[in-house]
């Protein structure tokens, strides 16, 4: 079922409040049964970062995994937890941060030469439609099959952000993921949506560039929660990120 947050695939190594997927004004799309598409360019957000209940890893951000917050805790109460960095203990690939995978119970770098199948730095989407055959382990792993070794330009197809040239990220555009420009100061950005019904966001924006964060535009503070416009703004203070 489509109860998950559809995160901005290919957006890596950022705290969940940054980056995200963007809806797009109407396009005539006919998709597999049960798939919803966004109507209008709305940016639904919540302001304060809160633990997000989940049933599986795909409902969490790319820097998170789904698990019980306490050791041996009730499996029925699971939340999105911060991913585990290199050399931390793990039980499955999804627990490790992008660019790492779980080997012998430890998160190790996926760019080590002995590991031929690169770990997808972005979550391979499993939207719960009839065609999806991905299982819990294969969701985060994909064999790279780039046809060339140069970094992708704008409009190049990509599987992960590391396929793209500097200043670009890998984000979804209809049926492909392509290299798009990282957002500059003042450009509209999208926060992860964590509540309500989630339409399938088939267009995705990149995250904000270095030194910028995605925040509510000052003159939009009075707007309703569902229509607040977010833009990339200069850091004034360090953004919080949950740890465990």
């Amino acid at each position: 079922t489509l109860n998950s947050v559809l995160n901005s695939n290919a957006i890596k190594n950022l705290p969940p409040p940054l980056g995200g997927a963007a809806g797009h004004p109407g396009s005539a799309v006919s998709a597999a049964p049960g798939i919803l598409y966004p109507g209008g360019n709305k940016y639904q957000t919540i302001d304060n970062y809160q633990p997000y209940p989940c049933a599986e890893d795909e409902e969490c951000g790319t820097d998170e995994y789904c698990a019980s917050p306490t050791r041996g805790g009730d499996a029925g109460v699971q939340i999105c937890l911060a991913c585990r960095k290199r050399r931390k203990r793990c039980m499955r690939h999804a627990m490790c941060c992008p660019g790492n995978y779980c080997k012998n119970g430890i998160c190790v770098s996926s760019d080590q030469n002995h590991f031929r199948g690169e770990i997808e730095e972005t979550i391979t989407e499993s939207f719960g439609n009839d065609h999806s055959t991905l299982d819990g382990y294969s969701r985060r792993t994909t064999l790279s099959s780039k046809m060339y070794h140069t970094k992708g330009q704008e409009g190049s197809v990509c599987l992960r952000s590391s396929d793209c040239a500097s200043g670009l990220c890998c984000a979804r555009h209809f049926w492909s993921k392509i290299c798009k420009p990282v957002l500059k100061e003042g450009q509209v950005c999208t926060k992860h949506r964590r509540k309500g019904s989630h339409g399938l966001e088939i267009f995705q924006r990149c995250y904000c560039g270095e030194g910028l964060s995605c925040r509510i535009q000052k003159d939009h503070h009075q707007a309703s929660n569902s229509s607040r416009l977010h833009t990339c703004q200069r850091h004034h203070h360090h953004h919080h990120h949950h740890h465990h």
Epitope: H131, S144, S145, E154, S156, V157, F174, W175, S176, K180
Partner: antibody, heavy 117, light 111 residues
């Protein structure tokens, strides 16, 4: 070398059905979007259907409800099930994929579908 | 849907001449900092071949004499010096929105 080979075309009566296949090789088939594009005799190109690497499907209004695109990643194959065929569906059908660029950058040689009584 | 209009319908030129083909969209095909316009070449009895993607970027193995330019609604494919093998039909395509649409084509023929 990337190869796309279509098959299954032929002569069919209006209202009939046909199933086209496209055998892919030379790339990790399951990771990439793949599409059908057609060209009526002496006419231009028309997009028919696409399926993403993660399985959702897209159609224009002209074929919606009549055509179904599907993929079998285990067999590296793409299919187009065409039902309720009309004379205006007569065309060369190409499968095309987007491997390097957000465009149809690799094409098969095409298979001809003729709808006529 | 986005309608693409190509002009001229036919271009009669000699080898060595410069060819300028136009593609106009009914609305902007720019988004996310990218022009979602592609150009293809098709010869009789053959499948189309990608020349230019994202408005101005060359496809793999495409000769440098082919270049694309433009933004928003107006795009141009330029062949700097026509070779005998360049006489063909050229199509523009937009991939900003579904359904993807193609222009009606420009036939470049030998004068």
């Amino acid at each position: 070398e990337v190869q796309l080979v279509e098959s299954g075309g032929g002569l069919v009566q209006p209202g009939g059905s046909l199933r086209l296949s496209c055998a892919a090789s030379g790339f990790t088939f399951s990771s990439y979007a793949i599409s059908w594009v057609r060209q009526a005799p002496g006419k231009g190109l028309e997009w028919v259907a696409s399926v993403s690497g993660w399985g959702d499907t897209y159609y224009p209004d002209s074929v919606k409800g009549r055509f179904t695109i599907s993929r079998d990643n285990a067999k590296n194959s793409l299919y187009l099930q065409m039902n309720s065929l009309r004379a205006e569906d007569t065309a060369v059908y190409y499968c095309a994929t987007s491997l390097q660029n957000y465009a149809f950058d690799y094409w098969g040689q095409g298979t001809t579908v003729t709808v006529s009584s | 849907e986005i309608v693409l209009t190509q002009s001229p319908a036919t271009l009669s030129l000699s080898p060595g001449e410069r060819a300028t083909l136009s593609c106009r969209a009914s609305e902007s095909v720019d988004d996310f900092g990218i022009s979602f316009i592609n150009w293809y070449q098709q010869k009789p009895g053959q499948a189309p071949r990608l020349l230019i993607y994202a408005g101005s970027k060359q496809g793999s193995g495409i000769p440098a004499r082919f270049s694309g330019s433009g933004s928003g609604t107006d795009f141009t494919l330029t062949i700097s010096s026509l070779e005998p093998e360049d006489f063909a039909v050229y199509y523009c395509q937009q991939l900003k929105e579904v359904p993807p649409t193609f222009g009606g084509g420009t036939k470049v023929e030998i004068k």
